[in-house]
């Protein structure tokens, strides 16, 4: 039994890190493997993660962590019974994938303006709380070509657009994701999408 692709891990910079790897053949990850992780400092405890299968030869482990601080560094040991298959380390602050934003809402009652709001996925004391920027994806359910991305580079979790920039009389969906430049994070997963019917008053044309 050998590791084909070494574990790579990402942290939500709050409470969970996710590690994924591939074995060289079909593996029952939960019965055959264990990932041990330990914060590097005196008297820290070793924790055991029971991996789950992610495809025939892929494994994934969710590592529970206390509030992450930038200095945190973990040792990782992947075991198959008594055999050490791989040894490595992981610094959560250097491999951040933010949590996905939540509660995406489209407010359509503001005159011919669409207001999209969502919630910052971090509590105010978390470092990422004041460092997230967002991308909002809006697309038409009727026309796959009608697909647009708005970059929200300010901190407020909201976006205003004129309803007239979208077609009237059809349904749209929106979703949002986050990243933090300060930690050079990857993008979060997309939030669940929300749907609305776009309608606005056409301007009166004089002839």
């Amino acid at each position: 039994m050998k590791v084909l692709q070494e574990p790579t891990c990402v942290s939500d910079y709050m409470s969970i890190s996710t590690c994924e790897w591939k074995m060289n053949g079909p593996t029952n990850c939960s019965t055959e493997l264990r990932l041990l992780y330990q914060l590097v400092f005196l008297l820290s405890e070793a924790h055991t993660c029971i991996p789950e299968n992610n495809g025939r030869a892929g494994c994934v482990c969710h590592l529970l962590m206390d509030d992450v601080v930038s200095a945190d560094n973990y040792t990782l040991d992947l075991w198959a019974g008594q055999q050490l298959l791989w040894k490595g380390s992981f610094k959560p602050s250097e491999h951040v994938k933010p949590r996905a934003p939540g509660n995406l809402t489209v407010h359509t009652n503001v005159s011919d303006t669409l207001l999209l709001t969502w919630s910052n996925p971090y509590p105010p004391d978390n470092y990422l709380y004041n460092h997230l920027t967002y991308a909002v994806n809006i697309w038409s359910e009727n026309d796959p070509a009608d697909f647009r991305i708005y970059n929200v580079t300010y901190l407020e979790p909201s976006l205003r657009i004129a309803a007239s920039t979208l077609k009237s009389g059809i349904s749209y969906r929106a979703r949002v994701r986050a990243w933090a430049q300060c930690y050079n994070t990857t993008w979060s997963e997309w939030s669940p999408s929300t749907k609305w019917h776009n309608s606005y008053r056409e301007p009166f044309e004089q002839h």
Epitope: S15, H62, M65, D66, D125
Partner: antibody, heavy 115, light 107 residues
Amino acid sequence: QVQLVESGGGLVQPGGSLRLSCVASGFTFSHSSMNWVRQAPGKGLEWVSYISRATGAVYYADSVKGRFTISRDNAKNSLYLQMNSLRDEDTAVYYCAREPVFDYWGQGTLVTVSS
Amino acid sequence: DIQMTQSPSAMSASVGDRVTITCRASQDISNYLAWFQQKPGKVPTRLIYAASSLQSGVPSRFSGSGSGTEFTLTISSLQPEDFATYYCLQWSSYPRTFGQGTKVEIK
């Protein structure tokens, strides 16, 4: 091994105050965020409060906000819950529980609010 | 605040039965969900975290699934020591909230 021992519970009249303590051993307390969780007699679990190891930030359940204060003394390996303006509905066993996500619990201390 | 609704609140089952308990969140919590077991007079213990990750030392007959707002705890073959109360917990945001509990009793 990890141990959490609560104390300070007892009988108190409505409107009164109590201070609960939780003494930790078997791990580096200063490196751990901590919680208080309570359970009224015959009822379910209710999260009460949290204090971060990283920032010292605190959070409270709406039912205790403004009345309870969580604090810690890392030099004494101790977690505290100052409970003021106690009400009948605060009667419960109070547990301290360690992060991440309540991996260890104390045995609890009973607080009874009654006239 | 996020509400967690567990069902059923109580159930009777026999040794060897497959038992399923569900937990519904009032809004999306991704996979930030844990399951706890509490026996009478005892302290709760964590069974599952991150919706589906089995806590080390917990028997493999326990499993969790779900994401977003719908979650399930399954006991594949109920054992005598499994008669207890089970709670779900969301830790996606503060305040953290538990479900109201499901008591699994002997039929």
